[in-house]
Structures are given as C-alpha cells and as structure tokens.
C-alpha cells in the first residue's frame, strides 16, 4: 500500500520528506516565505494530505502562489508610486506614498516606503501597516510675500495667492427682523478650521452675556481675492462656532474664536493654512514687522450680496495688505491710558502701528491674521488677530491697533481642534 512519490510544489516543500510513503502517512505542504498554498482557489498557510489504504493520496498537491498585497489603500491628499515594473503588488514589491506637494507634507518626515510583506500587507518600517498622514503645509504661500525691509504706509493690493489663509467671514442672522448681517476676516489653520476674533462671532443682541452667533448664520469664503468675482472662491458653512470661554466684551480680553467648517476645503495655490506660533507668553518682539490683509469692510450699510457679488465701492474690491511694526507693550499701554476711558491693553494683547498714525491701522478687518515671517522655519506664523483700536479710532496719531496675542492660546486652539500638539510639528517662532 505504498503511495506514489510526491513532488513538492514550485516555491514550496513537503514535510516530512521521505523516500517512501505508506498507508496512513501524512504530509504537510507549505510554501516558501512570500508564497501561499493555493488549493481550489482558496489560499491557506499549509495543506495536509494522507496516504490512503488503496495507495492513492487523499488530495492532489496544491500550488504555491506568490503573496499579493493587492492595490494599496488610498492616501487622503497623497499619491502612490510603484517602484516595480508593471505596478506589481506581490511579495517584496515596493510602493511609495507621497503627499500632494506643496500643499501637504508627510507627518514626521516619514519615507512613505511600504513593502509587500509575507503576510500580504503593505508594511512600513516605522508605521507598520498604518497609512502615513498628509498634513496641510502651513505658512508657505505659492507666491513669495514681499521683503519686510522697506516700510509701507497705507494699503497695497495683494496678488492672488499672497495670503492664501485669508478668509472672509459673513454672518447673516435671518432670525432677526430686519436681518442682521456683518463681516469679518479669519485665518485658515487646517483644511477644516478657521481662526478669528471672538467679537466677530458674538451676537450683539445680548450685552450682559456672551452668546455666539448660531452656526447656521455663518458662511466662510476662502481663496477670495476680488469680491466682485467669487467664482474662484470656496464657500463653506460652519459646523461649529467656538468662542473663547473667557472672552470679555468690556475690554476684548481673550478675543479669539474658531470656526469648524462643515467640510474640509481642498488646499491649493489660493487656499493654504497659516502656521500657529509656539506657546510663548512674550508674543512677537517689539519692532518686528508683520502683515495684515483685509478688504477694509468697515461700512455698516454694505449688504452681503453687495460684498459678495457686486463689489460695492464702500470696500476694497481687491484684498489689501499693510505692513506694521509691533509696538512695545509699555508704549501701547501708555498711549491708551492717556486717553479718556477704561481701555485696558492686557497681557493677552499686543499693539502694532505707527506713532504718527495713518491709514495703515484701519486696513485689517476684525479677526484677520497679523502674520510674521519666521526665519527659522521659513514660514508665516499668525501672531495676532485684529481685535480693537479701530476702525473707530482709525488713523489717529499714537492710536495703535490692538491684536489678540495668539501665542497665549496655542494649547486652547489645538485642544478645540482635537489635535495633540505633538502630532502637528508646530512651527516655532524665533
């Protein structure tokens, strides 16, 4: 009752390997690393056959098939390139994930290289089977912002893509009779979050308490350059409106807020986030130059439709920007204390502008980003948000614009966005 001699499958082996096999002898068929036993179109690690009483084997010898990791998972905001010819996805094949540059960058500078493992999964040395993450690049406009050496007083037209983080925030409260509507600016922090000033998103119907406007009343425009032409802009409704819990309407302390967009916006040359500073109570150093952009929306009688479609003359059609120096804190405090009124420039604020006054202190819309170029990371960092001191005092001598000191709120911002700071490789200032 001897069974016929067995030939191991190509790329496989049989155990035990004997010269002769008799009734009730069993053999285990297995495959080399990177191959799987294939029997009746079913993949398995091993297959057992037995020598029967009549001298035949209980089954035919299966084949060994090379492991196939199949098409790799798609990476959001990323691309896949195959290292092997014919886009092979079998054992030891290599692929490389990359992010859609220059708008996204791979988290932790990962190589993005994945190899098809013997187990049939794409594996990376660091991340294992997890896919890499493409994070939005921040603070790197597709156009170079102008050199900050020469001082500019007054506004200049911004070229498209110069301030890709600039957002126009439109609040239209249709529950009021008549409809209440107003505007402000904001800065894109990620594909889903806008940073702005709390006072832009506060309902003025209540003065005794701070109540945010309803998210249904908020629309955000990104990639907007000329308000007469919104065709190239992305508009998004709000999923959440988050005011800083300590925002004080008496003195605008903690004047900072976030809007979470209903859907992440696609990034591109005209829509890119700005970088957050590192947590630093000092804020930007005195005399550093920063830029603020805005459409100069200060006329209270402008309607949303006029702003978004007709480009009324009461505001700049084209995004304007201005260059302003940071003012020493003591000087700014003194300038406000010397005037009648209980204005307080707190440690959560800093000032910018020129002693001699001028139009420059008016150009930034409320909530707009005061950005400073960080030489170390070669990126633009949002150090301030247009808070107060204008427009009602606009252009007066020794009346500086007051900005929310963003570096005091970095932890709060990350917390609201639901991202641990360590994940994001924060850009550092100075």
């Amino acid at each position: 009752n001897e069974c016929p001699e067995l030939q191991p499958p190509v790329h496989g082996k049989i155990e035990p390997s004997q010269a002769k096999y008799f009734f009730k002898d069993q053999v285990l068929v297995s495959c080399d690393t990177g191959y799987k036993v294939l029997k009746d179109n079913v993949e398995m690690d091993t297959f057992q056959i037995e020598c029967l009483k009549d001298g035949t084997w209980s089954n035919k010898i299966p084949t060994c098939k090379i492991v196939d990791c199949r098409a790799p998972g798609e990476l959001e905001h990323g691309l896949i390139t195959f290292s092997t010819r014919n886009n092979l996805t079998t054992y030891k094949s290599e692929i490389k994930y990359s992010c859609q540059e220059p708008y996204y960058k791979m988290l932790n500078n990962n190589t993005g290289i994945y190899t098809c493992s013997a187990q049939g999964v794409w594996m990376n040395k660091v991340l294992g089977r997890s896919l890499p993450t493409c994070l939005p690049e921040c603070g790197q406009p597709s156009r170079s912002l102008p050199s900050l050496v020469k001082r500019i007083i007054g506004g200049r037209n911004a070229e498209p893509g110069l301030f890709p983080w600039q957002a126009l925030i439109v609040v239209e409260d249709t529950s009021r009779v008549p409809n209440d509507k107003w505007f402000g600016s904001g800065a894109l922090l990620s594909a889903s979050w806008i940073l702005t000033a709390a006072h832009v998103l506060r309902s003025q119907r209540r003065d005794t308490t701070v109540i945010p406007v309803s998210k249904e009343h908020v629309t955000v425009y990104l990639g907007l350059h000329d308000v007469r032409d919104k065709s190239g802009a992305v508009n998004s409704s709000a999923a959440r409106v988050v005011l800083h819990p300590d925002f004080n309407i008496q003195n605008y302390n903690h004047d900072i807020a976030l809007v979470q967009l209903q859907e992440p916006v696609p990034l591109g040359p005209h829509v890119m986030p700005v970088c957050l500073p590192r947590l630093e109570p000092e804020g930007p150093a005195p005399h550093m130059l920063g830029l603020v952009a805005g459409w100069g929306i200060s006329n209270p009688n402008v309607t949303v439709d006029e702003i978004i479609s007709s480009g009324t003359r009461t505001l700049s059609d084209v995004l304007q920007y201005v260059k302003l120096p940071v003012v020493p804190h003591a000087e700014c405090k003194t300038s406000y204390e010397s005037r009648s009124g209980n204005y307080s420039v707190t440690e959560n604020m800093f000032c910018a502008g020129y002693y001699e006054g001028g139009k420059d202190t008016c150009l930034g819309d409320s909530g707009g980003a005061f950005v400073i170029f960080d030489d170390l990371s070669q990126r633009w960092v949002v150090q301030g948000l247009v808070s107060w001191g204008g427009p009602e005092e606009c252009g007066s001598k020794q009346v500086y614009g007051v900005y929310t000191k963003v570096s005091n709120y970095v932890d709060w911002v990350w917390e609201q966005m639901g991202l641990p700071q360590s994940v994001v490789e924060p850009q550092v200032e100075r």
């Epitope: 009021r176 008549p178 409809n179 209540r206 003065d207 204005y343």
Partner: antibody
Framework: QIQLVQSGPELKKPGETVKISCKAS????????MSWVRQAPGKGLKWMGW????????TYADDFKGRFAFSLETSARTPYLQINNLKNEDTATYFC?????????WGQGTSVTVSS | DVLMTQTPLTLSVTIGQPASISCKSS???????????LNWLLQRPGQSPKRLIY???KLDSGVPDRFTGSGSGTDFTLKISRVEAEDLGVYYC?????????FGGGTKLEIK
C-alpha cells in the same frame, strides 16, 4: 469713564425733521449695541429699539417703525436718532443707552419739543 | 408685548426704614439661554436713568449693597434694606428677554 453725551435740546415745528446724536467714549464702541428710549413729559420709559454698532443694522419696536431711523458714524463713535415728519406727540426726552439689552449706561437725554 | 406691572405706584418711606417694590411680568422672563433678563433702574428727579440691578439680582458697580433684587419666572422684587435720602426717585423694572424690551410703569419712592 464711560460716557454717552447727547446733543442739545431741540424746538421743532410739526412736519420737520430732527436728528439727535449720542457721542460714546470710554469703551470699545463696536462691542455694545445702542438702545434708544423715549420718555414723554411726566410719563414712563418706552424702548424704541436698538442699533448693532458692529453691523450697523437697526431694529425698531413696532410703535417706532416708519418715521424713526437709527444710524451710526462709527469713526466718530456716534449713533444718531432721526425723527421725520415730527408730530406733537413726539414731544419727549430721548435717551440713548449703551447695550441692545443691557442699557447699563445712559446719556443725559435730549429734549425735543414739537410745537407750531 | 410683555406687560410689566409695578406695585405700588408710590411708596412713602421714612429714612432708615426698608422698602420693597414688586414687578410682575405677563409671561416668564426665563430666556432660552437659561438667564432671566430682568433689570431695575432708578431715575432721580431731573436726571437720566441709572441701572442698579441686572439679571434679577446682580448689582451694578457702585450700587450700595442695601439694594437687593430677587425673583424668578414672572414675579420679581427690589428691596432696599434702609432707605437713604439719595434713594428717592422713580424705580423702573424692565425685561430684555422678549422682543420688544418693555418697562414697568415706575414706582415713585418719596421720603416721608
């Protein structure tokens, strides 16, 4: 420190127009709405409505829709109340008060007398 | 509109004695945000009004603690523990919960 200073008394004829100002100082002007309140001689207070100093949008109580208009000159930190086509029953003292609902600081009042 | 009814119309009090003014609204003043926007102000003779109390019981800065506000829903009270000469004038309650905001008719506090 916080002050609301209103324009002086007005003597007008029926059918004329009056515009009252309320200069605000000592606080961030666009942070608070501004209410307008009427007090007829020997009578109580009546809320006329308010203006959002950030958006510039006015809201009127029903009795004050039509001939009454709230406006702003933000750069001068000054809200205005204009009454068109004055009637004898508009004779009253008009107050501005800081806040859409808070009304925590009040102007000194502007007396408007309508008489032929 | 919400009707605000103040009682009494006039209150004659001896200096040093307590005083109490009632204010009733025709509907609850509890707002959807959980707060009750009921306020009190004083208009001294020949002067502009001055707010004393907001959100039912919170005292404005500079207001003596002999003034207290209380109540909820539709019934509110302003109490003065010991009346002083400077307290004379007309007291108004007003609500800022339901549009349009409405004032009570006023209570004149006079010194006996």
């Amino acid at each position: 420190q916080i002050q609301l200073v209103q324009s002086g008394p007005e003597l007008k004829k029926p059918g004329e127009t009056v515009k009252i100002s309320c200069k605000a100082s000592g606080y961030i002007f666009t942070s608070y709405g501004m209410s307008w309140v009427r007090q007829a001689p020997g009578k109580g207070l009546k809320w006329m409505g308010w203006i959002n100093t950030y958006s510039g949008v006015p809201t009127y109580a029903d009795d004050f829709k039509g001939r009454f208009a709230f406006s702003l000159e933000t750069s001068a930190r000054t809200p205005y109340l204009q009454i068109n086509n004055l009637k004898n029953e508009d004779t009253a003292t008009y107050f501005c008060a800081r806040g859409g609902e808070a009304m925590d600081y009040w102007g000194q009042g502007t007396s408007v007398t309508v008489s032929s | 509109d919400v009707l605000m009814t103040q009682t009494p119309l006039t209150l004659s009090v001896t200096i040093g004695q307590p005083a109490s003014i009632s204010c009733k609204s025709s509907q609850s003043l509890l707002d959807s945000d959980g707060k009750t926007y009921l306020n009190w102000l004083l208009q001294r003779p020949g002067q502009s009004p001055k707010r004393l109390i907001y959100l039912v019981s919170k005292l404005d800065s500079g207001v003596p603690d002999r003034f207290t506000g209380s109540g909820s829903g539709t019934d509110f009270t302003l109490k003065i523990s010991r009346v002083e000469a400077e307290d004379l004038g007309v007291y108004y309650c007003w609500q800022g919960t339901h549009f349009p905001w409405t004032f009570g008719g006023g209570t004149k506090l006079e010194i006996k």
